[in-house]
């Protein structure tokens, strides 16, 4: 439970904090877990303990192993373990998974990439930043304190970012690098399960025999660009094109609109010269996208000739 993984590259500085916390006044002793041998506190040693911190200046592959820290107070002792792995430097640009720190996400509004573990070190600005091993250049990139700010973030900015800085210990300088993945969240758009605005579920639409009638299927899918979004009509559960009634046609193409910033589509069903048999059919408005499908059913009823009021949303 009180064990922490730490990793670094050979010939770089690595500083590890004891996983057990205590007041600054508490003493912390460090040991090689395997041998129980105490780690010296004298700074002339390459590996030495400095309170809560264990310092490898610089680290060597042979330093890999488990280290024990004991936080001692007048009333209790707390034990923690630091599992340290030091890797050989890669000859190429590739940063293996085991050297990657946690992935961070950014968006247009927030695009800070913090340099992992930097707070443990005695460093001075500016930080150097690399993306997929290429030094970052251009006004869009700003190294600010312990983080990188990217202006006008786009999906292409996703990738692996490495920060490089110098740790200073008693006048000696040691290099440190740390890499993490950055993903871009598209805050401009989102996708929802389709929401049908019209017709209402089980709506009764009044029509006049012999006249033309239009039914509009309208649905919204989210904000921004929508994938695989469509609205369409079915007759008795069959596609309009397969139903084989030339008087009933679905308008070609879909009209895209934006309602309160939402991406919406509508499809008009045109019934020419309404007949009695059309009243027996079930008209289904379907809205679909990647999330799924929603269906609203409409039926037609004969408009009473003496009723001149418009009851488009009249329910029985």
């Amino acid at each position: 439970k009180f064990s922490k993984q730490s990793w670094g590259l050979e010939n770089e500085a690595l500083i590890v904090r004891c996983p057990r916390q205590g007041k600054p006044s508490y003493t912390v002793d460090w040991y090689y877990s395997q041998t129980n041998k105490s780690i010296p506190t004298q700074e002339r040693n390459r590996v030495f303990a400095s309170g809560q911190l264990l310092k490898f200046l610089p680290a060597a592959v042979a330093d890999s192993g488990i280290y024990t820290c004991i936080v001692r107070s007048p009333t209790f002792n707390r034990t923690g373990y630091a599992n340290v792995t030091i890797y050989k430097k890669q000859s190429d640009c590739n940063v293996p998974d085991y050297l990657m720190y946690s992935t961070v996400s950014g968006s247009e509004k927030n695009s800070k990439i913090y340099c992992p573990t930097i707070d443990l070190y005695n460093w001075t600005a500016p930080l150097e930043w690399f993306k997929n091993c290429q030094a970052l250049q251009g006004s869009r990139y700003r190294a600010h304190k312990s983080f990188l700010v990217i202006d006008n973030v786009m999906t292409e900015d996703a990738g692996d970012y490495t920060c490089k800085f110098i740790h200073n210990e008693n006048g000696a300088n040691y290099s440190v690098t740390a890499t993490r993945s950055f993903t871009v969240k598209d805050e401009q758009g989102f996708s929802l399960f389709p929401v049908i605005g019209a017709p209402a579920q089980n709506e009764i639409k009044e029509v006049e025999i012999g006249k033309n009638a239009n039914l509009t299927c309208s649905a919204c899918f989210g904000k921004g660009t929508q994938f695989l979004a469509a609205v369409l009509w079915q007759l008795n559960g069959t596609k309009i094109t397969d139903f084989g009634e030339p008087r009933i046609q679905q308008e070609e193409g879909q009209n895209q609109s934006f309602s309160n910033g939402l991406a919406c589509l509508d499809m008009v069903l045109r019934i020419a010269d309404v007949k009695e048999e059309d009243l027996l059919l079930q008209y289904d408005c379907l809205a679909l996208n990647l999330h799924g499908l929603r269906r609203h059913t409409v039926r037609l009823s004969r408009k009473n000739p003496i009723d001149h009021h418009s009851h488009h949303h009249h329910h029985h």
């Epitope: 993903t183 660009t225 994938f227 469509a230 990647l290 799924g292 499908l293 269906r295």
Partner: antibody, heavy 116, light 107 residues
Framework: EVQLVQSGAEVKKPGESLKISCKGS????????IGWVRQMPGKGLEWMGI????????RYSPSFQGQVTISADKSISTAYLQWSSLKASDTAMYYC?????????WGQGTLVTVSS | EIVLTQSPATLSLSPGERATLSCRAS??????LAWYQQKPGQAPRLLIY???NRATGIPARFSGSGSGTDFTLTISSLEPEDFAVYYC?????????FGQGTKVEIK
């Protein structure tokens, strides 16, 4: 754990009918699209069509419209791909895939061999 | 129908080398593009979705970029298990379509 388990390999003669299955488990079967993908020997992936099991609504790629039928039985969380009259050119590996924002889970594939 | 064209058809590289695969759409698909890896006798495996998002459990050496009509899958340093066929797929519009595939083989 989300799983799609497909029925076993089939060897058929031209003109015969066939129905292969894809059983979903570990998720709400009715709430996700199921797609079917064909891969002919040594060739690439071809999207055939899709079904929304909660509604049984299907959508086909134009190349497969009228050639196959996609259906589902939500009571047993199973999607189907069927042929009424097989041809030698239907010989292929057929995969089902769940779509949840992308084709995120795939069945192991069903090999269909049509030969006289 | 949106046509996806992948290039090159075959890429011959050695382990440790960088692989760059291209996918071009006949019309804009925004960022509705996915990449899959397929090994012989196995079902395809999702690597990247929405052009640049790594799927769960996919190593950091795989990265996707691009939007609109031009997309790239990059494998920063090829591991022996990465030699396979890679497909791009658009899910912007109906019908969903795949590219014809790029085979990454050992040089």
């Amino acid at each position: 754990e989300v799983q799609l388990v497909q029925s076993g390999a089939e060897v058929k003669k031209p003109g015969e009918s066939l129905k292969i299955s894809c059983k979903g488990s570990g998720y709400s079967f009715t709430s996700y699209w199921i797609g079917w993908v064909r891969q002919m020997p040594g060739k690439g992936l071809e999207w055939m069509g899709i079904i929304y099991p909660g509604d049984s609504y299907t959508r086909y790629s134009p190349s497969f419209q009228g050639q196959v039928t996609i259906s589902a039985d939500k009571s047993i969380s199973t999607a189907y791909l069927q042929w009424s009259s097989l041809k030698a050119s239907d010989t292929a590996m057929y995969y089902c895939a769940r779509i949840g924002g992308m084709f995120d889970y795939w069945g192991q594939g069903t090999l269909v061999t049509v030969s006289s | 129908e949106i046509v996806l064209t992948q290039s090159p058809a075959t890429l011959s590289l050695s382990p440790g080398e960088r692989a760059t695969l291209s996918c071009r759409a006949s019309q804009s698909v925004a960022n509705a593009l996915a990449w899959y890896q397929q090994k012989p006798g196995q079902a395809p495996r999702l690597l990247i979705y929405k052009a640049s998002n790594r799927a769960t459990g996919i190593p950091a050496r795989f990265s996707g970029s691009g939007s609109g009509t031009d997309f790239t899958l990059t494998i920063s340093s090829l591991e022996p298990e990465d030699f396979a066929v890679y497909y791009c797929q658009q899910y912007y519009g109906w019908p969903i379509t795949f590219g014809q595939g790029t085979k990454v083989e050992i040089k």
